[in-house]
Amino acid sequence: MMTGTIETTGNISAEKGGSIILQCHLSSTTAQVTQVNWEQQDQLLAICNADLGWHISPSFKDRVAPGPGLGLTLQSLTVNDTGEYFCIYHTYPDGTYTGRIFLEVLESSVAEHGARFQIP
C-alpha cells in the first residue's frame, strides 16, 4: 500500500533571466527513494539516481544544475519556461509517486517568488 505523500513548492513565479529551485519532498513512507526524474510536460530534464548520480538532458545542460539534494535548479529563465514541472519519485517497494510544480516566468521585475521549500 502506498502511504507516502509528496510536498512540493507548489505554484511559484520567477523573473525572466533569473533562476529558481524546484524541490519536492516525499514523506509519510519508509520506502527507499531509488531515483527522481524531473520532467517538464513531455520533456525529460534530469534524472537523479541515488547510486549512479545525475543525468542532465543535453537540451537543458546549459540551463539546469543538479541539486540542491534531489532538487533541480533552473537558470537563465525565459518566458517559455512557464508551465508544469513534475518530480517523479521511484521508490522501493512502494512504486512511483509524482509531484507537480507550476512555474510562471514573468517579464516584470516585480515577480513574487514562491516561498522556498526547505527539506528538513
Epitope: 531509488t34 526524474n37 520533456q43 534524472i47 547510486d51 549512479l52 545525475w54 543525468h55 542532465i56
Partner: antibody, heavy 119, light 107 residues
C-alpha cells in the same frame, strides 16, 4: 586518450566465482560511473549494474543481486566485477563501460572479457 | 523492467541505401534512449544519446529521433563499414535495458 583495459579470459567450473578487472586511464576516474554489461554467445546486451567511482555506491540489476559485486580501487583507477555461484548460462563476454559525465549513456567500453563456465 | 523491442531483427541492404531501425519501449521513457553499433568480436560503440544527439566523431549519416515510446535510428546512406548490429538502450529507470539488436547485412 580514454582507455578501459580488461583482464584476460577465464574458464571456471559451475559454482565457482570469477573476478574481472577494468583498468581506466585518460580521464579522472572518480568523476565517472563504471558499468558492467554482458553478452552471451550470439545474444544481445544485458546490463549487470554500475558503481559510482567516487563514493563506491553500487547499483546491481535485481537479476544479479546476491551474486554480483562491483567494487573500485581508486588508487589504481580500476573497477572490478565479481560474479559468484557461476552457472553455465553465465558464459558470456563481460564488458566494462563508462557512463558519460552527467549522462547515462555508455560512451567508452572495454575490449571485453570472455568468461566460460563449464564442468 | 522496461522492455525495448527492436524491429526488424535483421535486414539486408546495399551500399547507398537508406536504412531505418525502430525501437519501441514498453512504457514512456521520454528521450532517455541511446543507440550503439557493434561489430563481430568488438565492443559496442555509442552512436546516439538522448534519442537524437549524435556522439562525438559519429558520421552525420547517422541520426536518431523519437520520444515517449517510439524511437528510430536512421542511416541515410549505408556505407560498407556500417554493416553491424545496432542496439537501443533505455536509461529512464533502472535496470537499464537494451533492445535485442538489429543486424544489418549486405544484400
Amino acid at each position: 586518450q580514454v582507455q578501459l583495459v580488461q583482464s584476460g579470459a577465464e574458464v571456471k567450473k559451475p559454482g565457482a566465482s570469477v573476478k574481472v578487472s577494468c583498468k581506466a586511464s585518460g580521464f579522472t576516474f572518480t568523476e565517472y560511473t563504471m558499468h558492467w554489461v554482458r553478452q552471451a554467445p550470439g545474444q544481445g546486451l544485458e546490463w549487470i549494474g554500475g558503481i559510482n567511482a567516487k563514493f563506491g555506491r553500487q547499483l546491481i540489476h535485481q537479476k544479479f543481486k546476491g551474486r554480483a559485486t562491483l567494487t573500485v580501487d581508486k588508487s589504481i583507477s580500476t573497477a572490478y566485477m565479481e560474479l559468484s555461484r557461476l552457472r553455465s548460462d553465465d558464459t558470456a563476454v563481460y564488458y566494462c563501460a563508462r557512463s558519460s559525465y552527467y549522462r547515462f549513456d555508455l560512451d567508452y567500453w572495454g575490449q571485453g572479457t570472455t568468461v566460460t563456465v563449464s564442468s | 523492467d522496461i522492455q525495448m523491442t527492436q524491429s526488424p531483427s535483421s535486414l539486408s541492404a546495399s551500399v547507398g541505401d537508406r536504412v531505418t531501425i525502430t525501437c519501441k519501449a514498453s512504457q514512456d521513457v521520454k528521450t532517455a534512449v541511446a543507440w550503439y553499433q557493434q561489430k563481430p568480436g568488438k565492443a559496442p560503440k555509442l552512436l546516439i544519446y538522448s534519442a537524437s544527439f549524435r556522439y562525438t566523431g559519429v558520421p552525420s549519416r547517422f541520426s536518431g529521433s523519437g520520444s515517449g515510446a517510439d524511437f528510430t535510428l536512421t542511416i541515410s546512406s549505408l556505407q560498407p563499414e556500417d554493416f553491424a548490429t545496432y542496439y537501443c538502450q533505455q536509461h529512464y529507470t533502472t535496470p537499464w535495458t537494451f533492445g535485442q539488436g538489429t543486424k544489418v547485412e549486405i544484400k
